[in-house]
Structures are given as structure tokens and as C-alpha cells.
């Protein structure tokens, strides 16, 4: 049975050309974590595998970084980069569990921060 | 479609060297974590060596270690097996093997495979 | 000798139902997912189950996979002849960080 819940981020906000830590917090449940996936709409942005380590997908090498912990940092943000991002949490024996962020990337200087996670 | 073609295969002295290819098409393949399986004539299957994304972690079955190295060109979407000391037992049909996305899973796609024979 | 064990053969008769077991440890079957693959006389091995109890599509659902504790077992229901092939377990081993496999199970189709 699936007991664990995932915290995430939600809905954040990051000025044009400045970095955000993108992270989730899987908790309740004693199921070792596999590998996360991280995927923005269908498109895979990185994994952190518990065996291999960290792979960040080629398309994304230059403004993506692993961490801190499972979490993900994205770097040199565009408005592009507005959308949804889910964390896969590929557990066992539990399964997977799936946490959802929105990111907005506003042209302002002025950008408002959401939830906790955030880089000041 | 998905696929996988080995090459490099064919008749070497005990003590020689041989380089196996795999070819792989219809998947990104950097982002996969390939393995090397091999079946000796009549019997069964035995995973050789594994390698991660980038190439930066390789693990390999005892019976081959010191010998073989794994290896992978993500430009030309082609894995490798360099087999150096060849022996008798290491006569086999060589499959490459693409890994699920969460690699603990399994592997989902194999080549036809390419046959090795050592003798002299 | 292969870390996880299986019989080396089974039989049974068309439309009949057949379970191949696969009996490991707590570093690999215990603790990780277990896969398993058909492999027709002369051809490469094709998945059939992976992540225990996870099919493939286009892999008919008269294959199951199950797991307890440090087994793990391959049914096939309804039986056909061309179900006639060597079955393999496989698992990822914690300890050893390696791939291990059951030495595999000839099923003949009476």
C-alpha cells in the first residue's frame, strides 16, 4: 500500500535569467527511493538514479545542475521555461508517486517567490 | 522503432582481442543505461557489464573483470565492448542490451547479437 | 552456478496453466524488482515481465508475474505451442552491484 506523500515547491516565480531550485520531499512511508526522474510536460530533464548517480539529458547540460539532494537546479531561465515540472519518485516497494511545481518565469524585475525551497 | 545491431564479432585465439559494437537507433540514446549479456553455446544467459549514462560508472561480472571494458560514444549512439585476454569460456553469442529508464527495472530492447568464438 | 535458482525444466499441456519459479536473496529478489525475459529456440531474449509484476505491451496477458519474500514466480496460462521456449528470472543485485540471472527453465509444450 501506498502510504508516503510528496511536498513540493508548488506554484513558484523566478526572474528571466536567474535560477530556482526545483525540489520535492518524499515522506510517510519506509520505501527506498529507486531513481527520481525529473520531467518537464513529456521531456526528461534529469535522473537521479540511487546506483549511478546523476544524469542531466543532453538537451539541458547547460542550464540544469544536479541538486541540492534530489532536487534540481535550473539556471539562465527564459520565459521558455514557464510550465508545469514533476518529480517521479520510483520507489519499492510502494511504486511511484509523482509531485507537480508550476513555474512562471516572469519578465519583471520583480518576481515573487512562492513556497518554501527557494533560493533568497 | 527501437533497435539494437551488435557487430565486431567472429574467431579469435585464446589470449587475442576483439572489439564489439552495438549499434543503437529510434530511442535518445544518451539517455539509457546499456548493458552487455552474453549466452554460451547451450547455455544460459549471463550479464557481462553495465554502463550509466555518460559513462562515467561501469560495473562488471567477476568472470570478466580486468579483461573486458565497456564503453560508449553517445555521439555516434553506438555502445562497446573491448575484450582483451580472451579464454575458451568466453565463447558465446554477445547481446547489447538497452536498460528501462529506471534500469532496476530490467532490460527492455536486445540486439540479434553477435557470436565470439575463442579457440585455437 | 547462478545466484537466483530456477528448475531447469516444465511442462505442461496447451491451455493448461504453468508457474516457473525463481528463488533468490534478500540483495536481490527481496529487496529489488525482478524481470523476466523468453527466449525462443535461436533468437534473442524478449521481455516479458519487469518490475515484478509489470507487462510490456504486446506481451499477452496470460503472462503474470508475482513476488513473496525471496521468490518470484512466471505464470502462463492457457498454454500454446509457441509458448515452448527457455524462461529466465533476472534481478538487479544490491550487494554485488551486478545483473543476476536464473540459470533458466525449458518449457515443453506436451
Known amino acids: 500500500m501506498m502510504t508516503g506523500t510528496i511536498e513540493t515547491t508548488g506554484n513558484i516565480s523566478a526572474e528571466k535569467g536567474g535560477s530556482i531550485i526545483l525540489q520535492c520531499h518524499l515522506s510517510s512511508t519506509t520505501a527506498q527511493v529507486t531513481q527520481v526522474n525529473w520531467e518537464q510536460q513529456d521531456q526528461l530533464l534529469a535522473i537521479c538514479n540511487a546506483d549511478l548517480g546523476w544524469h542531466i539529458s543532453p538537451s539541458f547540460k547547460d542550464r540544469v545542475a544536479p541538486g541540492p539532494g534530489l532536487g534540481l537546479t535550473l539556471q539562465s531561465l527564459t520565459v521558455n521555461d514557464t510550465g508545469e515540472y514533476f518529480c517521479i519518485y520510483h520507489t519499492y516497494p510502494d511504486g511511484t508517486y509523482t509531485g507537480r511545481i508550476f513555474l512562471e518565469v516572469l519578465e519583471s524585475s520583480v518576481a515573487e517567490h512562492g513556497a518554501r525551497f527557494q533560493i533568497p | 522503432e527501437m533497435q539494437l545491431l551488435e557487430s565486431g564479432g567472429g574467431l579469435v585465439q585464446p589470449g587475442g582481442s576483439l572489439r564489439l559494437s552495438c549499434a543503437a537507433s529510434g530511442f535518445t540514446f544518451d539517455d539509457y543505461v546499456m548493458s552487455w549479456v552474453r549466452q554460451a553455446p547451450g547455455k544460459g544467459l549471463e550479464w557481462v557489464s553495465l554502463i550509466n549514462w555518460n559513462g562515467d560508472k561501469t560495473y562488471y561480472a567477476d568472470s570478466v573483470k580486468g579483461r573486458f571494458t565497456i564503453s560508449r560514444d553517445n555521439s555516434k549512439n553506438t555502445l562497446y565492448l573491448q575484450m582483451n585476454s580472451l579464454r575458451a569460456e568466453d565463447t558465446a553469442i554477445y547481446y547489447c542490451?538497452?536498460?528501462?529508464?529506471?534500469?532496476?527495472?530490467?532490460?527492455?530492447?536486445w540486439g540479434q547479437g553477435t557470436t565470439v568464438t575463442v579457440s585455437s | 552456478q547462478s545466484v537466483l535458482t530456477q528448475p531447469p525444466s516444465a511442462s505442461g499441456t496447451p491451455g493448461q496453466r504453468v508457474t516457473i519459479s525463481c528463488s533468490g536473496s534478500i540483495s536481490n529478489i527481496e529487496t529489488k524488482y525482478v524481470s523476466w525475459y523468453q527466449q525462443l529456440p535461436g533468437t534473442a531474449p524478449k521481455l516479458l515481465i519487469y518490475?515484478?509484476?509489470q507487462r510490456p505491451s504486446g506481451v499477452p496477458d496470460r503472462f503474470s508475474g508475482s513476488k513473496s519474500g525471496t521468490s518470484a514466480s512466471l505464470a502462463i496460462s492457457g498454454l500454446q505451442s509457441e509458448d515452448e521456449a527457455d524462461y529466465y528470472c533476472?534481478?538487479?543485485?544490491?550487494?554485488?552491484?551486478?545483473?543476476?540471472f536464473g540459470g533458466g527453465t525449458k518449457l515443453t509444450v506436451l
Open positions: 542490451a538497452k536498460h528501462w529508464i529506471v534500469f532496476q527495472y530490467g532490460m527492455d530492447v
Open positions: 533476472v534481478s538487479w543485485d544490491a550487494s554485488l552491484k551486478s545483473w543476476v
Open positions: 518490475n515484478s509484476d
